[in-house]
């Protein structure tokens, strides 16, 4: 039994880091493998992660962490029974994938303005709480070409757009994702999408 593709990990910079790797053949990850991880810190304990299958030869493990600070570094040991298959380390702050924003809501009752709001996925005491920026994706269910991205570079989790920038009388969907420049993170997954019917009064045309 050998590791074909070494574990790579990403952290949500709150409580979970996810590590994925590939074995050299079909493997029952949960019965055959264990990923041991420990914070490099005298006052820390060793933890064991039981991996799950992720395709035939792929494994994934969700490492639970109490919290994360930028200097944190973890040792990782992948075991198959008594055999050490791989040894490595992982610094969460260098591999951050933020949590996806939630509770995306479209408020359509604000005088021909669409107000989109969502929730910051982090609690106020987390470092990323004040460092997230967002991308909002709006698209038409009827017209695949009607697809747009709005970059929200301010901290408030909301976006206002004129309803008239979208077509009237048709349904739209929106979703939002986050990233943090300070840790050069990857983008989060998209939030679940929300749907609304776009209708607004056309301005009266004078001839």
């Amino acid at each position: 039994m050998k590791v074909l593709q070494e574990p790579t990990c990403v952290s949500d910079y709150m409580s979970i880091s996810t590590c994925e790797w590939k074995m050299n053949g079909p493997t029952n990850c949960s019965t055959e493998l264990r990923l041991l991880y420990q914070l490099v810190f005298l006052l820390s304990e060793a933890h064991t992660c039981i991996p799950e299958n992720n395709g035939g030869a792929g494994c994934v493990c969700h490492l639970l962490m109490d919290d994360v600070v930028s200097a944190d570094n973890y040792t990782l040991d992948l075991w198959a029974g008594q055999q050490l298959l791989w040894k490595g380390s992982f610094k969460p702050s260098e591999h951050v994938k933020p949590r996806a924003p939630g509770n995306l809501t479209v408020h359509t009752n604000v005088s021909d303005t669409l107000l989109l709001t969502w929730s910051n996925p982090y609690p106020p005491d987390n470092y990323l709480y004040n460092h997230l920026t967002y991308a909002v994706n709006i698209w038409s269910e009827n017209d695949p070409a009607d697809f747009r991205i709005y970059n929200v570079t301010y901290l408030e989790p909301s976006l206002r757009i004129a309803a008239s920038t979208l077509k009237s009388g048709i349904s739209y969907r929106a979703r939002v994702r986050a990233w943090a420049q300070c840790y050069n993170t990857t983008w989060s997954e998209w939030s679940p999408s929300t749907k609304w019917h776009n209708s607004y009064r056309e301005p009266f045309e004078q001839h």
Epitope: F41, L42, L43, E45, A46, D67, V69, S70, A71, D72, Y127
Partner: antibody, heavy 125, light 111 residues
Framework: QVQLQQPGTELLKPGASVSLSCKAS????????MHWVKQRPGQGLEWIGL????????KFSENFKTRATLTIDKSSSTAYMKLSSLTSEDSAVYYC??????????????????WGTGTTVTVSS | DIVLTQSPPSLAVSLGQRATISCKAS??????????MNWYQQKLGQPPKVLIY???NLESGIPARFSGSGSGTDFTLNIHPVEEEDVATYYC?????????FGGGTKLEIK
Amino acid sequence: QVQLQQPGTELLKPGASVSLSCKASGYTFTSYWMHWVKQRPGQGLEWIGLIHPNSDTTKFSENFKTRATLTIDKSSSTAYMKLSSLTSEDSAVYYCAKSKIITTIVARHWYFDVWGTGTTVTVSS
Amino acid sequence: DIVLTQSPPSLAVSLGQRATISCKASQSVDYGGDSYMNWYQQKLGQPPKVLIYAASNLESGIPARFSGSGSGTDFTLNIHPVEEEDVATYYCQHSNENPPTFGGGTKLEIK
């Protein structure tokens, strides 16, 4: 208030073993690491090892790995250190000490925030 | 192991004056931009008591006349103005790796 109570003295013969106790009160015993520190007469401080009362995880200084055993009795909130094969070099004051972790955005710091009263161990034939 | 060397081994300071104690580490005790150095005071017949943690942070309840500074391998504890009750031995201690070690101590007396 937070207190770590240790017996005052232990008089032992070379080659014997001793079990030192440290009774904690005033805080959640199982939430904090407990350390043991040695201080020889008129000398500095030497870290022996630590134990987590909730998991029994232990770590030791190389100098004490083979002779020191750390245990916990959760029911009485008491930590114990057993030291075996005693010699005159083991004559010292032994302190238990609770540590506190301070987490900043950058790093995790720890220090000994509460010390026991100390047990004076004398090894003499 | 990281060796901490304190100097001077003893010093006598007049009341109201400044006491400066140095602690030099055999290798850096910094990591991630922070310094892992603590200072303790031990009075005769008593256990040690923390004064400063993370090089420069004053422990709660400790008078502001105690201050810590430094980074890397060089650290300093300052006491100003020195008072009668400060007669004690002072120890530095690093918390950067296993094992944590202490300096040899500096005995402060009043002139």
